[in-house]
């Protein structure tokens, strides 16, 4: 039994880091493998992660972590029984993938303005709470070419756009994702999308 693709890990910088790897053949990850991880810190001890299958030869492990700070470094040991298959390390602050925003809502009752709001996925005491910026994706269900991205570079989890920038009388969907420049993170996954029917009063034509 050998590791074909070494584990790569990403952290949500809150409580979970996810590590994925591939074996050289079909593997029952949960019964055959264990990933041991330990914070390089005086008052720490090893934790064991039981991996799950992620395709025939793929495995994934969700490492539980508390109070991540920038200096944190973890040792990782991948075991198959008594055999050490791979040894490595992981610094969560250098591999951050933020949590996806939630509760995306489109408010259509504000005089020809669309107000999109969503929830910051972090609690106020987490460092990323005040460092997220967002991208909002809006697209038409009827016209695949009608697809747009709005970058929200301020901290408030909301976006206002004029309803007239979208076509009237058709349905649109929106979703939002987040990233943090401070840790040069990757983008989060997209939030679940929400749907609304766009309608607004055309202004009277001037003659």
């Amino acid at each position: 039994m050998k590791v074909l693709q070494e584990p790569t890990c990403v952290s949500d910088y809150m409580s979970i880091s996810t590590c994925e790897w591939k074996m050289n053949g079909p593997t029952n990850c949960s019964t055959e493998l264990r990933l041991l991880y330990q914070l390089v810190f005086l008052l720490s001890e090893a934790h064991t992660c039981i991996p799950e299958n992620n395709g025939g030869a793929g495995c994934v492990c969700h490492l539980l972590m508390d109070d991540v700070v920038s200096a944190d470094n973890y040792t990782l040991d991948l075991w198959a029984g008594q055999q050490l298959l791979w040894k490595g390390s992981f610094k969560p602050s250098e591999h951050v993938k933020p949590r996806a925003p939630g509760n995306l809502t489109v408010h259509t009752n504000v005089s020809d303005t669309l107000l999109l709001t969503w929830s910051n996925p972090y609690p106020p005491d987490n460092y990323l709470y005040n460092h997220l910026t967002y991208a909002v994706n809006i697209w038409s269900e009827n016209d695949p070419a009608d697809f747009r991205i709005y970058n929200v570079t301020y901290l408030e989890p909301s976006l206002r756009i004029a309803a007239s920038t979208l076509k009237s009388g058709i349905s649109y969907r929106a979703r939002v994702r987040a990233w943090a420049q401070c840790y040069n993170t990757t983008w989060s996954e997209w939030s679940p999308s929400t749907k609304w029917h766009n309608s607004y009063r055309e202004p009277f034509e001037q003659h």
Epitope: L43, E45, V69
Partner: antibody, heavy 116, light 110 residues
Framework: EVQLLESGGGLVQPGGSLRLSCAAS????????MSWVRQAPGKGLEWVSG????????YYADSVKGRFTISRDNSKNTLYLQMNSLRAEDTAVYYC?????????WGQGTLVTVSS | QSVLTQPPSASGTPGQRVTISCTGS????????VSWYQQLPGTAPKLLIY???HRPSGVPDRFSGSKSGTSASLAISGLQSEDEADYYC???????????FGGGTKLTVL
């Protein structure tokens, strides 16, 4: 709300013993390392001892090694400090603190006075 | 003698900016994060800055921390009378296998 409540302090003669307790609430106690920090009257802070979340890793300041024992009971959400062979210089307010790279929550402290 | 060195006292007038330094070595500050604690008279210490420069929720943004090499500093801008307290820096020291504090700095608001 995180709360740490120390108890067990008091007056003790040199050479005597005392056991301090720290009752924790408002967080998952068994997930976190804990420490004892003390402060002699009019002096600065001194870290005394720390223990990892599952008792697997324990450290002491040189000044208390061999005399003090830190322990915890995760089922009772309680941290302990057994202090033996106490000396006058151990007189201080003893704080327990939730521990990581830093001490993010502190108790209000319990006063230990070692005097004849 | 503390492992981390802080000035014993500092002072400033309301509205001023005050900086407190903390000097260590490669076995503590140089390879670990620095924290700062505020101790108001007659109370337990409180975490003010962690991970060198991060503020816990509830700590005003007048307080800021920084680290460079084996030294760290705490800056307080727009000084207020309620900032009068003792301030301690701290870091884990891997050669001592212990957490080490600075001797503390007594801040007086004139």
């Amino acid at each position: 709300e995180v709360q740490l409540l120390e108890s067990g302090g008091g007056l003790v003669q040199p050479g005597g013993s005392l056991r301090l307790s720290c009752a924790a609430s408002g967080f998952t106690f068994s997930n976190y390392a804990m420490s004892w920090v003390r402060q002699a009257p009019g002096k600065g802070l001194e870290w005394v001892s720390g223990i990892s979340h599952g008792n697997g890793s324990i450290y002491y300041a040189d000044s208390v090694k061999g005399r003090f024992t830190i322990s915890r009971d995760n089922s009772k959400n309680t941290l302990y400090l057994q202090m033996n062979s106490l000396r006058a210089e151990d007189t201080a307010v003893y704080y327990c603190a939730k521990t990581g790279r830093h001490f993010d929550y502190w108790g209000q402290g319990t006063l230990v006075t070692v005097s004849s | 003698q503390s492992v981390l060195t802080q000035p014993p006292s500092a002072s400033g007038t309301p509205g001023q900016r005050v900086t407190i330094s903390c000097t260590g070595s490669s076995s503590n500050i140089g390879n670990n994060t620095v924290s700062w604690y505020q101790q108001l008279p007659g109370t337990a210490p409180k975490l003010l800055i962690y991970d060198n420069s991060h503020r816990p929720s509830g700590v005003p943004d007048r307080f800021s921390g920084s680290k460079s090499g084996t030294s760290a500093s705490l800056a307080i801008s727009g000084l207020q009378s309620e900032d009068e307290a003792d301030y301690y820096c701290g870091s884990w020291d891997y050669s001592l296998s212990a957490y080490v504090f600075g001797g503390g700095t007594k801040l007086t608001v004139l």
